[in-house]
Amino acid sequence: MRRERGRQGDSSSCERQVDRVNLKPCEQHIMQRIMGEQEQYDSYDIRSTRSSDQQQRCCDELNEMENTQRCMCEALQQIMENQCDRLQDRQMVQQFKRELMNLPQQCNFRAPQRCDLDVSGGRC
């Protein structure tokens, strides 16, 4: 089907939607994936919840947004921003970013186009 895209709506409404959802399960899920089951990452006590459970909770939270597909970029950027200070080195940043990019697919959403995850002004 051919479609001409009109306006996508405004980004401030996405920011409001992202603010309303709990992104912690997504952050925990990605951290678990890049840390394995290392005990050092226990600030959320993530060891008590299996990664697959966290993934499901993460997908459920993302689904809570009114327009999940359009607001996906803002959600991913917020996750990156939230976790930036916890990422200890450049390699960890790249690993986190790779996992974050895979998140939409894991939740059966399309990956967002034109989404710049380098949002932390060089901190990450």
């Epitope: 089907m1 996508q8 970029c73 990019m101 710049d116």
Partner: antibody, heavy 123, light 110 residues
Framework: EVQLVESGGALVQPGGSLRLSCAAS????????MTWIRQAPGKGLEWVAN????????DYLDSVRGRFNISRDNAKSVLYLQMNTLSADDTGVYYC????????????????WGQGILVTVSS | QSVLTQPPSVSAAPGQKVTISCSGT????????VSWYQQLPGTAPKLLIY???KRPSGIPDRFSGSKSGTSATLGITGLQTGDEADYYC???????????FGGGTKLTVL
């Protein structure tokens, strides 16, 4: 070598129509977004329209939406811009460009440009 | 008036360094990638920087790009007289569903 060659520019009266063509060669046309960009005399660059690889998605500058139609023929490697209800504000050089936008986590960028074709709308 | 704001002109002597800023908002530069173009007099524009910081092959490393928050910057070191041109930034705006160009900056090499 990548080449983009525009044609179809002309002097046209206000309210008139024109169709621009852009013949592409030197790359696999069907795998790239394509974009029209224009420049009024002595002014800056202004994006006009994007079209996805398979033609399924199109985006337009607000002031041309409903008047212009971007289309492509992947079999012939040709990009088109049908322009209707033209006004003096549409006068300028129109560039056909290859857009490097990929399917995710990348941005629009125009890595190859045609030489440009002049469209003049005047009575 | 362009939504992306660039200084109308900048100038510097040969061999010096110059920076050109491009200021936007959260719905454009803040969320999306920035590219930069050089337009020499009477010619079609040429891509200098894409995805904020990347250089296409053939573009010398005298040209660099960076982005922080809702602003982007093009840097040019070792200025040459051949760098005299108009420079434009561009990015996607998610609210407008459109590519935006800055108003352009005229670089003069003194």
């Amino acid at each position: 070598e990548v080449q983009l060659v525009e044609s179809g520019g002309a002097l046209v009266q206000p309210g008139g129509s024109l169709r621009l063509s852009c013949a592409a060669s030197g790359f696999k046309f069907s795998t790239f977004y394509m974009t029209w960009i224009r420049q009024a005399p002595g002014k800056g660059l202004e994006w006009v329209a994007n079209i996805k690889q398979d033609g399924s998605e199109k985006d337009y500058l607000d002031s041309v939406r409903g008047r212009f139609n971007i289309s492509r023929d992947n079999a012939k490697s040709v990009l088109y811009l049908q322009m209707n209800t033209l006004s003096a504000d549409d006068t300028g050089v129109y560039y056909c460009t290859r857009n490097g936008l990929q399917d995710s986590y990348s941005g629009d960028f125009f890595d190859h440009w045609g030489q440009g074709i002049l469209v003049t709308v005047s009575s | 008036q362009s939504v992306l704001t660039q200084p109308p002109s900048v100038s510097a002597a040969p061999g010096q360094k110059v920076t050109i800023s491009c200021s936007g908002t959260g719905s454009n530069i803040g969320h999306n990638y920035v590219s930069w173009y050089q337009q020499l007099p009477g010619t079609a524009p040429k891509l200098l920087i894409y995805d904020n910081t990347k250089r296409p092959s053939g573009i010398p490393d005298r040209f660099s790009g960076s982005k922080s928050g809702t602003s982007a910057t093009l840097g040019i070191t070792g200025l040459q007289t051949g760098d005299e041109a108009d420079y434009y930034c561009a990015t996607w705006d998610a609210d407008l569903s459109a590519v935006l160009f800055g108003g352009g900056t005229k670089l003069t090499v003194l």
